[in-house]
Amino acid sequence: FNISGCSTKKLLWTYSTRSEEEFVLFCDLPEPQKSHFCHRNRLSPKQVPEHLPFMGSNDLSDVQWYQQPSNGDPLEDIRKSYPHIIQDKCTLHFLTPGVNNSGSYICRPKMIKSPYDVACCVKMILEVKPQTNASCEYSASHKQDLLLGSTGSISCPSLSCQSDAQSPAVTWYKNGKLLSVERSNRIVVDEVYDYHQGTYVCDYTQSDTVSSWTVRAVVQVRTIVGDTKLKPDILDPVEDTLEVELGKPLTISCKARFGFERVFNPVIKWYIKDSDLEWEVSVPEAKSIKSTLKDEIIERNIILEKVTQRDLRRKFVCFVQNSIGNTTQSVQLKEKRG
């Protein structure tokens, strides 16, 4: 199709080489079409404006994204050619940063139902650049935490070094929905609830004498509880002896509950004590079996191919540790009688 009639938007993504970060493009179809498609301007499907020049489907994923190759080749369907780019409804998610993401991206409705619809498309010219050195030493992270129940704020990474007074007008989105209230480079949250968690996007316009473009950054916000003040506790094994059959395989599980820590480095390992000697056992990787806002339960198993007489003289010790302290639980094997 002819893209010369598409409305054009220029965007800049300046990414930090120090951190992982994502990026998004919204299918900003010209008003009033976009409301009909993605409902980003908060109309319900029943409240479609009258006299729509473009009567598309109400299916939220009913847009098609393309990339325009720089060599003039035909448009490429994003889903077929770019595994690191994911389409979610009307949003294109870039999972990894890099200058190779620079280019022109076009979105338009899949269903073309009238002659007006041909021009119902948006061309987004994306420029991707690495952040230049320490233009701002303490720029906000693309991953920000809010402490539940307290006051917090979400900062726009590309503007966090500017004071509120010099900050340009910022457009904020949360999970793809425009936050029409917010205007500054920081969203202040008086009391943090779990619904404040999500993907936030901040946009502002930068201009020079020739043109203007939108500078965009994406912030992943999670709501967290305060760091635990407790060392981890071992849920299993509970008993310090375990009846076993000689010659049979045996798996002993160690399950431990770790309280939430913002910087989470849990340790869970097995070691064996045999008279005066003790050594760590190489066992399968630990796995998280339950994760909640407040804590995480991690399990690690020790596997014996077959229980020997020597194993009955040993103590099998599960050791768990967080930044507060450590806990151990030892198990002595006992031969089953009869």
Partner: antibody
Framework: SVEESGGRLVTPGTPLTLTCTAS????????MSWVRQAPGKGLEWIGI?????YTAYASWAKGRFTISKTSTTVDLKITSPTTEDTATYFC?????????????WGPGTLVTVSL | AQVLTQTPSSVSAAVGGTVTINCQSS????????LAWYQQKPGQPPNLLIY???KLASGVPSRFSGSRSGTQFTLTISGVQCDDAATYYC???????????FGGGTEVVVK
């Protein structure tokens, strides 16, 4: 500052466009809202146009009004006025920290809808 | 749609007294605190007094204060002056802009 214009006497059903002219600031940086007040009554929030171009309307105002803008003006179109639309119409600018704290208001323009 | 109920509709106060105006929202406002208070005198546009429930707007005397308890918001005028005679409105801003609305207004008469 902001100033409204275009208020006049119209007959029911005749579309009317009111204009809000901004000076001393850029509409590409501030959200603008329209508020009205019928004679002797309270304030009613009509809608907003965001600097990004996004528009939103109060549930009662949807379909009855359209807000649009140019680089220096914001328009409010009353699509099919009825006598109940007789009021003083104000435009108001959003604040620096927030788009809904209206710290700059126009003096208002009076619209009278009558047969 | 959300409902903002402002009470009382009219209140009379002596100079130096205290006036309390309430605004009850049927549901949480945006971010739990997005409610503003405006003062309007006859023939004039409204004037912003309080935003974000309790923040005093620039140039507004400190005798005006705002507070919140859940979905109830209160405007207090301590040490009322003759110049405070006006109608006061609350404006609630919600997650869905279609719900944004002013309260019905409270007329303050100063004796």
């Amino acid at each position: 500052s902001v100033e409204e214009s275009g208020g006049r006497l119209v007959t029911p059903g005749t579309p009317l466009t009111l204009t809000c002219t901004a000076s001393g600031f850029s509409l590409s940086s501030y959200a603008m809202s329209w508020v009205r007040q019928a004679p002797g009554k309270g304030l009613e929030w009509i809608g907003i146009i965001h600097y990004s171009g996004y528009t939103a309307y109060a549930s009662w105002a949807k379909g009855r009004f359209t807000i649009s803008k140019t680089s220096t003006t914001v328009d409010l179109k009353i699509t099919s006025p009825t006598t109940e639309d007789t009021a003083t119409y104000f435009c108001a600018r959003g604040g620096d920290a927030d788009n809904f704290y209206y710290n700059i208001w126009g003096p208002g323009t009076l619209v009278t809808v009558s047969l | 749609a959300q409902v903002l109920t402002q009470t009382p509709s009219s209140v009379s106060a002596a100079v130096g007294g205290t006036v309390t105006i309430n605004c009850q929202s049927s549901q949480s406002v945006y971010s739990n605190n997005h409610l503003a208070w405006y003062q309007q005198k006859p023939g004039q546009p409204p004037n912003l007094l309080i935003y974000r429930a309790s923040k005093l707007a620039s140039g507004v005397p400190s005798r005006f204060s705002g507070s919140r308890s859940g979905t109830q918001f209160t405007l207090t005028i301590s040490g009322v002056q003759c110049d405070d005679a006006a109608t006061y409105y609350c404006l609630g801003v919600y997650d869905d802009d279609a719900d944004n609305a002013f309260g019905g207004g409270t007329e303050v008469v100063v004796k």
